[in-house]
């Protein structure tokens, strides 16, 4: 929301998690055969076919780098629950190792469990809705958002104590992640720091900051699944 079209293929880690051929959520390539996304994304997937699109800028147009991968295994975080934003992580094992190249490349992720400094500008990208009418873009969008300190995010007027040490917030004043961006990456200084949570949340409202799962807080779990 309030972002702009990304430079084509400049974010080679970006994934589109798809259900029955349609974009459902964002994702981020963290290893040759693994994409990290949000657990809530697959809550309503039921019997649908889940696939991962890599190397894409446009969802609809043919591009040489684009390739759709089947999912061999979906591993939601064991503590994720439908009614909470906590532990909202999902690892998707691709049916085969991704073919790497300039437009497909894993992103280094943060392992040091330390908060990103408030005010740090971080990049969020996705194919989520771009206006309040719900318009879905065909091409990848991105926005730079300042990290918001947890105390402010936990105010009663904001997220009222819901932001644990395993979550982080970014400002949401007109520019924000929104529906369809869930599971996508929050990248600070070229390193994956957060994953867009997939709770239903008003977008672009200054008093309801974007909530992101801190990957560093889940390093042990990610490593154990990827091992």
């Amino acid at each position: 929301l309030g972002g702009r079209e990304a430079e084509a293929h400049a974010r080679p880690y970006m994934a589109s998690v798809q259900l029955n051929g349609a974009h459902l959520c964002g994702g981020v390539l963290v290893a040759e055969q693994w994409v990290l996304s949000a657990a809530h994304c697959l809550e309503d997937a039921a019997d649908g076919k889940v696939q991962v699109l890599l190397g894409a800028h446009s969802l609809s147009q043919p591009e040489p780098s684009k390739r759709l991968y089947d999912v061999l295994r979906a591993v939601p975080h064991p503590d994720s629950q439908p009614d909470t934003i906590d532990h909202d992580l999902l690892l998707l094992q691709l049916s085969e190792k991704a073919t790497l190249g300039p437009a497909v490349r894993p992103l280094p992720w943060q392992r040091v469990d330390r908060d990103v400094a408030p005010g740090t500008l971080c990049d969020v990208a996705g194919w989520g809705i771009v206006n309040h009418a719900g318009r879905r873009p065909d091409s990848l969008q991105h926005v730079l958002l300042p990290v918001l300190d947890r105390a402010t995010c936990n105010r009663r007027t904001h997220h009222d104590g819901a932001i644990t040490e395993r979550l982080m917030c970014a400002e949401s004043n007109r520019r924000d992640s929104c529906k369809g961006d869930s599971g996508g990456p929050l990248v600070c200084g070229g390193v994956l720091e957060g994953v867009v949570t997939s709770g239903s949340r008003v977008c672009g409202n200054r008093k309801k900051p974007g909530i992101y799962t801190r990957v560093a807080s889940y390093a042990a779990w990610i490593d154990s699944v990827l091992a």
Partner: antibody, heavy 115, light 107 residues
């Protein structure tokens, strides 16, 4: 268990200063603003101000801005309220309270200003 | 500053009565209103936040409603332990402000 434990009662002379402490435990201190409220004997509640323990940023009730100082010591998870130039009307119970999540309050500190 | 005008300032009621306390804000505060209960010599205890959400552990006989400028705290069936003073608080705008309190006494 979340607890906010305040320092003991104080008796001060007019013109003096008082510093009240509020030690937090049971949660990550820097994850929540701390605000301060006072209650004069037999009166209602009056908001003094608040502090962000992460940044040290403060917001004040204009009435107290010139006399109140809010600080934190993150190493001990303690918030402080200092009130200067005390007068008899400052006699009150002073409370700290966590901003956000469950409404946790300290037990209160009685400050008596008397000559 | 936003004034929070609470009424009545006191009321007498019996155990089992339905009690309603109102709070009127001098300007729109959305639903950024909390209600507190205070007993003599004790710190205030949170009952309601966001105008209508009960804090955990608060009995279901306490309910809050309203938005904008008009807010209500209702005790559906007054219990002996409910005799206390009740305050509303707006946290939409600085400075945060409280109502002057409503003392609920035994009839």
């Amino acid at each position: 268990e979340v607890q906010l434990v305040q320092s003991g009662a104080e008796v001060k002379k007019p013109g003096a200063s008082v510093k009240v402490s509020c030690k937090a435990s049971g949660y990550t201190f820097t994850s929540y603003y701390m605000y301060w409220v006072r209650q004069a004997p037999g009166q209602g509640l009056e908001w003094i101000g608040e502090i962000n323990p992460t940044s040290g940023d403060t917001n004040f009730n204009e009435k107290f801005k010139s006399r109140a100082t809010l600080t934190v010591d993150t190493s001990t998870s303690t918030a402080y309220l200092e009130l200067s130039s005390l007068r008899s009307e400052d006699t009150a119970v002073y409370y700290c309270a966590r901003e956000g999540g469950f409404a946790y309050w300290g037990q209160g500190t009685l400050v008596t200003v008397s000559s | 500053d936003i004034q929070m005008t609470q009424s009545p300032s006191s009321l007498s009621a019996s155990v089992g009565d339905r009690v309603t306390i109102t709070c009127k804000a001098s300007q729109n505060v959305d639903t950024d209103v909390a209600w507190f209960q205070q007993k003599p010599g004790k710190a205030p205890k949170g009952l309601i936040y966001s105008a209508s959400s009960r804090y955990s552990g608060v009995p279901s006989r306490f309910s809050g409603s309203g938005s904008g400028t008009d807010f209500t705290l209702t005790i559906s069936s007054l219990q002996p332990e409910d005799f206390a003073t009740y305050y509303c608080q707006q946290y939409n705008n600085y400075p945060l402000t409280f109502g002057q309190g409503t003392k609920v006494e035994i009839k």
